[in-house]
C-alpha cells in the first residue's frame, strides 16, 4: 500500500544522511541542479530538480523515493513554478539543503 | 547524436580472454551510466553488468568472478574484460546506454559478434 | 537475482488483432510504489529497442497501439492493433536490483 507520510520523510531524511555522510568524491561528478523552493509540492520540486541528474549511483534511491513520493510523473527536462530557475548548485549542496529543511519539517511534525 | 560502437577481436580460443571496446559520442560518459548485454546465437539477452556515471561498477551475480568492467571517461570508453572463456560465451555484444531515471537501456550499439573456438 | 519468465515463448496473431505477452518476475519489481520493468522489441539482425519504462510507460516515438501493465510480480505487453512491422521478439526486464535481469524473450509473428 501507500507509504504512510511521516514513514516517508523518515526514510528519506535517513537516505540523505547516508549521502552526506558517505560522500567522498565529488557527488554527482559536481554536477548542477536547479535549486527550488522548499514550500509546498517539495517531493515533486526536488524529483524535477535531481531527475536531470544521470548516472549518478549514490543518488538513485533518493530518486526512487521522490518519484514514488510524488503523485505525478515527472520527466528529465520537467520544470514547475517550483524551481528557483536563476539559481543552479551542485547536488552535494542541494542534498545538504533538502536534508536541512526535511529535518525540521520532521521535528515540526509536518508530515505532507 | 548519441551514438555507441562496440569493437572486439571477432575469434577467441577457448580458455582465452575477450577485451571488448564501447566507443560512445553525443554524450558523457561521467553523467552517463553504460551496460553490457550479450545474446548468443538463436536466443534472448543477459545483462553481464554495467559502470555508473561516478564509477560504481554492477556485476551479474554469476559472472562476476570472470568479467571487469572498466572506462576512460576522457576518451569517451567502456571496456568489458572477460577471462576463461568457453565455447558458450559465443555471443552477440552490446554495450547499452542507460536514460535519465528510471535508467532504463535507451540506445544500443550495433553489436559485436564474438566466436570463441579453436 | 531476480528471475524473469516471459510467455507464451512465442505466439501468432493476425493482422490487426491484439497481441498480449506476459512477464512474471520471482519476487516483487516494485520500490516506493514503483514498478521496475521495462519493455524491449528486437527486429532481427537489431539491437533492442526500448518501448515502454516503468511497467506501463510509452517511450518517445514508440506508437500507442503499445501499452504496459501491471506491478509487483505480473505484467504485460498488449500490442493493439497488431501491424506487420511488429514482427519482433519482445523482451521484458528490470532493474529493481543493482544485479539486473531480462526476460527469455517473446517471438511474436503476424499471420
Known amino acids: 500500500g501507500p507509504v504512510p507520510p511521516s514513514t516517508a520523510l523518515r526514510e528519506l531524511i535517513e537516505e540523505l544522511v547516508n549521502i552526506t555522510q558517505n560522500q567522498k568524491a565529488p557527488l554527482c561528478n559536481g554536477s548542477m541542479v536547479w535549486s527550488i523552493n522548499l514550500t509546498a509540492g517539495m517531493y515533486c520540486a526536488a524529483l524535477e530538480s535531481l531527475i536531470n541528474v544521470s548516472g549518478c549511483s549514490a543518488i538513485e534511491k533518493t530518486q526512487r523515493m521522490l518519484s514514488g513520493f510524488c503523485p505525478h510523473k515527472v520527466s528529465a527536462g520537467q520544470f514547475s513554478s517550483l524551481h528557483v530557475r536563476d539559481t543552479k548548485i551542485e547536488v552535494a549542496q542541494f542534498v545538504k539543503d533538502l536534508l536541512l529543511h526535511l529535518k525540521k519539517l520532521f521535528r515540526e511534525g509536518q508530515f505532507n | 547524436e548519441v551514438q555507441l560502437k562496440e569493437s572486439g577481436p571477432g575469434l577467441v580460443a577457448p580458455g582465452g580472454s575477450l577485451s571488448i571496446t564501447c566507443t560512445v559520442s553525443?554524450?558523457?560518459?561521467?553523467?552517463?551510466?553504460i551496460n553490457w548485454v550479450r545474446q548468443p546465437p538463436g536466443k534472448g539477452l543477459e545483462w553481464l553488468g554495467m559502470?555508473?556515471?561516478?564509477?560504481?561498477?554492477d556485476y551479474n551475480d554469476a559472472l562476476k568472478s570472470r568479467l571487469s568492467i572498466s572506462k576512460d571517461n576522457s576518451k569517451s570508453q567502456v571496456f568489458l574484460e572477460m577471462n576463461s572463456l568457453r565455447t558458450d560465451d559465443t555471443a552477440t555484444y552490446y554495450c547499452a546506454r542507460d536514460g535519465y531515471f528510471p535508467y532504463a537501456m535507451d540506445f544500443w550499439g550495433q553489436g559485436t559478434s564474438v566466436t570463441v573456438s579453436s | 537475482d531476480i528471475v524473469l519468465t516471459q510467455s507464451p515463448a512465442s505466439l501468432a496473431v493476425s493482422l490487426g488483432q491484439r497481441a498480449t505477452i506476459s512477464c512474471r518476475a520471482s519476487e516483487s519489481v516494485d520500490s516506493y510504489g514503483q514498478s521496475y520493468m521495462h519493455w524491449y522489441q528486437q527486429k532481427a539482425g537489431q539491437p533492442p529497442k526500448l518501448l515502454i519504462y516503468l511497467a506501463s510507460n510509452l517511450e518517445s516515438g514508440v506508437p500507442a497501439r503499445f501499452s504496459g501493465s501491471g506491478s509487483r510480480t505480473d505484467f504485460t505487453l498488449t500490442i493493439d492493433p497488431v501491424q506487420a512491422e511488429d514482427a519482433a521478439t519482445y523482451y521484458c526486464?528490470?532493474?529493481?536490483?543493482?544485479?539486473?535481469?531480462f526476460g527469455g524473450g517473446t517471438k511474436l509473428e503476424i499471420k
Open positions: 526486464q528490470q532493474n529493481a536490483e543493482d544485479s539486473r535481469t
Open positions: 559502470i555508473w556515471g561516478d564509477g560504481r561498477i
Open positions: 553525443g554524450f558523457s560518459l561521467t553523467d552517463s551510466s
